[in-house]
């Protein structure tokens, strides 16, 4: 948790935060673990500490080595260790195993590959998508935000697909790239323990006082059909049916889908005119099946009027 | 210096009800995570409820969920807990204390703590 | 929820001697592990956080190890007024939950 692999390539940018998470008015301090000098915050060095953020614009092999982050409250430093390490381009197409992202798995309805590690950069849409090198053309493909739709997956759509950007800093533009395989399954029929998609576990959902808000609990059971399978809310251990809220409501969302897919339930929580004791309630997306019961705990909090980027993942 | 005073507590009977109050001083207040904790006589401590710095979010140890409230006020410094239907296993001394990192959807460790209260559940 | 077991229970030693008391997680904490001293009537001081950062004020004779699911608290060598009972408590995740505690008593 507290110590980081991160990657990249010669003469891209890359980005890595700090694995220790504080508070945005914690000071954070980078250095080079080897030599415990302190890296620098000013934009104009390549390579430069801004808070959370360690940035090589552009990296350069050299870079590769551990960096240690000390996050400093008032009365607590804690530390987190990034492992860079930087690579040669590769002249031919093949990305090496140890440039690739986490592999992802999709079926035949509505397949997303997410851009990894996206969120930290400065970019803008669209994303260009490449699968084995090759730009993706055709109307089953569909960049949208920081990620791909594949329409219609076949397992001919199994490989590596390769997400380019541009990341911008004080008007200078950087190009990076990232690779992860998507893989299609195509097993028969299975049961699995409840695998909960949204929302994150302990995720902080903003919200408008005065306006409506949803909350959408999507988990996936396995393949093919499931003889018990189930998503649900609570609001503070308690069912809905039971909370006796009249605003707030819940309704079954996109069903079943058993086409070469998984077997995904979903279930929309609506808060309708959001209120100051909405924000006090503990919110459970709980998904159950035969195998046993997960849940995640999702919290509101009030939207900041202005809305910046969260440091945070 | 950061201090931490809890009132409220007492002899109550099976099924009443309780508030719990700690008031806070050395510190910004707002700025902080606030948490209470149980401790049975002659037993160890047990987490009961964490509320977030604005107040907004909130948890509860499964033992005492819907039954017990945790709020605070932070213009008068002070950390609340409502305990309604009390039970007998609800005796102990309860401490208040500060989570000195509280970042969003984390825990850290309790660097302040209460002298406690009494919260007795007899009949 | 994470069950954290500490042994021994209770630890017989005499002042000057060294104390290693264990704690140990049913799963893994990472280095989100701290440790607690409480004496009677008193409410908990914290010693350690991250499993080896000494909090401000502590001791230099007390020091943390571990990471993953196995953790120790080390006295290097005990004090009258370390006599007291040590709980260890993690914080990566809800509920937090502490330990039973270890009694450290004079022999």
């Known amino acids: 948790k507290f110590s980081k692999q991160s990657w990249g390539l010669e003469n891209e940018a890359l980005i890595v935060r700090c694995p220790r998470q504080g508070k945005p008015s914690y000071t954070v301090d980078w250095y080079y673990s080897q030599t415990n000098k302190s890296i620098p915050t000013q934009e104009r060095n390549r390579v430069f500490a801004s808070g959370q953020l360690l940035k090589f614009l552009p990296a350069a092999v050299a870079d590769s080595g551990i960096y240690t982050c000390i996050v400093r409250s008032p009365t607590f430093n804690r530390t987190g260790y990034a492992n860079v390490t930087i690579y040669k381009k590769q002249s031919d197409c093949n990305v090496p195993d140890y440039l690739m992202y986490s592999t992802v798995s999709g079926s035949e309805k509505n397949s997303k590959i997410y851009c990894p590690t996206i969120d930290l950069y400065n970019w803008t849409a669209p994303l260009e998508w490449f699968k084995n090198c090759q730009a993706l053309q055709g109307s089953r493909y569909r960049a949208h935000k920081s990620f791909l739709v594949i329409d219609n997956v076949m397992t001919e759509d199994a490989g590596d697909y390769t997400c380019k950007f541009i990341h911008n800093e004080n008007g200078a533009n950087y190009s990076v790239t990232a690779t992860r395989s998507f893989t299609v399954k195509d097993e028969q029929g299975f049961s699995l323990f409840p695998v909960i998609g949204a929302p994150a576990q302990n995720e902080i959902k903003e919200v408008e006082i005065g306006k409506n808000a949803n909350l959408t609990c999507s988990a996936c059971f396995g393949k093919g059909t499931q003889f018990l399978a189930a998503v649900l809310w609570q609001l503070n251990g308690t069912k809905i049916t039971d909370f006796g809220e009249p605003r707030i409501q819940q309704e079954e969302g996109q069903n079943q889908s058993f086409s070469n897919g998984l077997a995904c339930l979903d279930m929309v929580l609506r808060i309708a005119d959001v209120k100051e004791e909405d924000l006090l309630l503990q919110y459970d997306c709980l998904a159950l099946n035969l195998h046993g019961l997960r849940r995640h705990t999702v919290r509101l909090s009030r939207k900041n009027p202005i809305d910046h980027h969260s440091i945070y993942c | 210096e950061v201090q931490l005073l809890e009132s409220g507590g007492g002899l109550v009977q099976p099924g009443g009800s309780l508030r719990l109050s700690c008031a806070a001083s050395g510190f910004t207040f707002s700025s902080y995570d606030m948490i209470w904790v149980r401790q049975a006589p002659g037993k160890g401590l047990e987490w009961v409820s964490t509320?977030?710095?604005?107040?907004?979010?909130?948890a509860y140890a499964d033992s005492v969920k819907g039954r017990f409230t945790i709020s605070r006020d932070n213009s008068k410094n002070t950390l609340y807990l409502q305990m309604n239907s009390l039970r007998a296993e609800d005796t102990a001394v309860y401490y208040c204390?500060?989570?000195?990192?509280?970042?969003?959807?984390?825990?850290?460790?309790?660097?302040?703590w209460g002298q406690g209260t009494l919260v007795t559940v007899s009949s | 929820e994470i069950v954290l077991t500490q042994s021994p229970a209770t630890l017989s030693l005499s002042p000057g001697e060294r104390a290693t008391l264990s704690c140990r997680a049913s799963q893994s904490v990472d280095d989100d592990l701290a440790w607690y001293q409480q004496k009677p009537g008193q409410a908990p001081r914290l010693l350690i956080y991250?499993?080896?950062n000494r909090a401000t004020g502590i001791p230099a004779r007390f020091s943390g190890s571990g990471s993953g699911t196995d953790f120790t608290l080390t006295i290097s060598s005990l004090e009258p007024e370390d006599f007291a009972v040590y709980y260890c408590?993690?914080?990566?995740?809800?509920?937090?939950?502490f330990g039973q505690g270890t009694k450290v008593e004079i022999k």
């Open positions: 408590q993690q914080y990566i995740t809800a509920p937090l939950t």
């Open positions: 991250d499993a080896s």
């Open positions: 509320i977030r710095g604005e107040g907004g979010t909130t």
């Open positions: 204390a500060r989570d000195p990192w509280s970042t969003e959807g984390s825990f850290f460790v309790l660097d302040y």
